[in-house]
């Protein structure tokens, strides 16, 4: 009779992560008597996957009933496949021996490849805020996918970006892969409502790419513009001075009034108004008692925005002359007001 051959008909098998892999193996003869074992790999490190004779293999089931005397089908199923299960699997026939069974013949091996979906892309921006006209970097990461081929695109408000660099690791063969991409984005004053999107397409996603987003509101700082104006006289000896703080983001802002360099009042922006572009406006009033001053008064509106160095705008209040409306003529915007009479 012809010597037993171990046949593994499939050179390779491709399975999606989470599914069951079927590894086929048949013997051409019932002789010699002895068990079949399945291994992953060859040589000293080969890992026992299934032993017909003994052991506990919770993820492995046999395709046929191996207890039947005339059985020659030694195929197995491995459940809940993960990328870590990838490798070459060998079906090995042992000859019954004493005290130990002896390896008799091995199949040619079946390479199990695992298709695994990429994880949801995670987009992260710079640690510190940046101002318009500056270029900032965003990173996008996705892990655990297989095979290695993957496509990554960047968008800002639906417009595809071109200034980015992408790496897929590792470079060589692996059970699963990771992608890391860094995109450069130039900020504009209108970016408070903008979004940066990282889109990942992979064969396992069946044309439905995964997206990760970052809001530029977490990244941008729009510094305020200041305008100090003197309003018409309220009473014979009182002048109303306003400081318009316009187009700033984020809201965190502290305003200090100085009279001739001395702190008069400090307040925090609270009842702000929001512009269409997501920036904020705010207005603070200062009521100055002119009769309390013999000389001209230099009024300064000093603003500290989002922990940045203070910016200020000054206004000279003429005491000698009859107070009249002074200041710049920039178009007013919707503003909130905050009136405090300090006298």
């Amino acid at each position: 009779e012809e010597e037993l051959q171990v046949i593994q008909p499939d050179k390779s098998v491709l399975v999606a992560a989470g599914e069951t892999a079927t590894l086929r193996c048949t013997a051409t003869s019932l002789i010699p008597v002895g068990p079949i074992q399945w291994f992953r790999g060859a040589g000293p490190g080969r890992e026992l996957i299934y032993n017909q004779k003994e052991g506990h293999f919770p993820r492995v089931t046999t395709v046929s009933d191996l207890t039947k005397r005339n059985n020659m089908d030694f195929s197995i199923r491995i459940g809940n496949i993960t990328p870590a299960d990838a490798g070459t699997y060998y079906c090995v026939k042992f000859r019954k021996g004493s005290p130990d069974d002896v390896e008799f013949k091995s199949g040619a091996g079946t390479e199990l490849s695992v298709r695994a979906k990429p994880s949801a892309p995670v987009v992260s921006g710079p640690a510190a805020r940046a101002t318009p006209q500056h270029t900032v970097s965003f990173t996008c990461e996705s892990h655990g996918f297989s095979p290695r081929d993957i496509t990554l695109k960047w968008f800002k408000n639906g417009n595809e970006l071109s200034d980015f660099q992408t790496n897929v690791d590792p470079v060589g063969e692996s059970v699963s892969y990771s992608i890391h991409s860094t995109a450069k984005v130039v900020l504009t004053r209108e970016d408070v409502h903008s979004q940066v999107i990282c889109e990942v397409a992979h064969v396992t996603l069946q044309g439905d790419p995964l997206r990760g987003t970052a809001n530029l509101s977490e990244t941008i700082r729009v510094p305020p513009t200041l305008e100090v104006t003197q309003q018409p006289v309220r009473a014979e000896n009182q002048v109303n001075v306003t400081c318009q703080v316009r187009k700033f983001y984020p809201q965190r802002l502290q305003l200090t009034w100085l009279e001739n360099g001395n702190v008069s009042r400090t307040e925090t922006a609270s009842t702000v108004t929001e512009n269409k572009d997501g920036t904020y406006n705010w207005m603070s009033w200062l009521l100055v008692n002119v009769s309390a001053h013999r000389d001209d008064v230099k009024l300064t509106c000093q603003v500290e925005h989002d922990g940045q160095p203070a910016v200020s705008k000054s206004h000279d209040l003429k005491v000698s002359a009859h107070p009249k409306e002074q200041g710049s003529n920039t178009a007013a915007e919707n503003t909130g007001s905050n009136e405090r009479n300090i006298y």
Epitope: Q37, F39, R40, G41, A42, G43, P44, G45, R46, E47, L48, I49, G55, G87, V92, D100, E103, D169, P170, V171, G172, E173, S174
Partner: antibody, heavy 117, light 108 residues
Framework: DVQLVESGGGLVQPGGSLRLSCTAS????????MSWVRQAPGEGLEWVSA???????YYTDSVKGRFTISRDNSKNTLYLQMNSLRAEDTAIYYC???????????WGLGTLVTVSS | EIVLTQSPGTLSVSPGERVTLTCRAS??????IAWYQQKPGQAPRLLIY???SRATGIPGRFSGSGSGTEFTLTITSLQSEDFAVYYC??????????FGGGTKVEIK
Amino acid sequence: DVQLVESGGGLVQPGGSLRLSCTASGFTFRNYGMSWVRQAPGEGLEWVSASSGSGSTYYTDSVKGRFTISRDNSKNTLYLQMNSLRAEDTAIYYCAKVTWNNFFDYWGLGTLVTVSS
Amino acid sequence: EIVLTQSPGTLSVSPGERVTLTCRASQGIAGKIAWYQQKPGQAPRLLIYDASSRATGIPGRFSGSGSGTEFTLTITSLQSEDFAVYYCQQHYDWSPLTFGGGTKVEIK
């Protein structure tokens, strides 16, 4: 957590014998290849012997016929019986778990074998 | 037997520097190379396998590359804890499994 603990090292005269043990925990011992790797004082690493998940044994040429690797799966223990020891066998002997594609993913802290008269 | 030759034998570097270690095989090994780190008085620790796959828990500053007979281990920004001896090992041919002679990375 995978743990490998070697024991049995010591001082032995040339021509003498020693038996090293490695007790494993944290994984299904019977399913995996196990190996001995040694390191002579101030030298590099040298693979000595291995026992596969099926019990097949492998040796480097310099120890064939003198060293015997074995395992007791019921005790999760790997052994290395070393006979006809020579001065050049002096080394730290590490027990290591072998992955399915033949590299070493976990190592014990090692046991020192000194062969000297 | 596959012989692995590591170069240089010793490398003197400052923390923060980029380090590249080389391992050459006497024949093609199909990318089956592993890298280990060993600190004085400690057991080796697996860093890289299959030439470029990072082992569990290994920081991203360690990376492996190469194919055929020439392989490299790169440490992008050397930390104080990275000063050690680095060994390559081929896991292509198990008769026998072989290691390189090691590269010592020491403080400049």
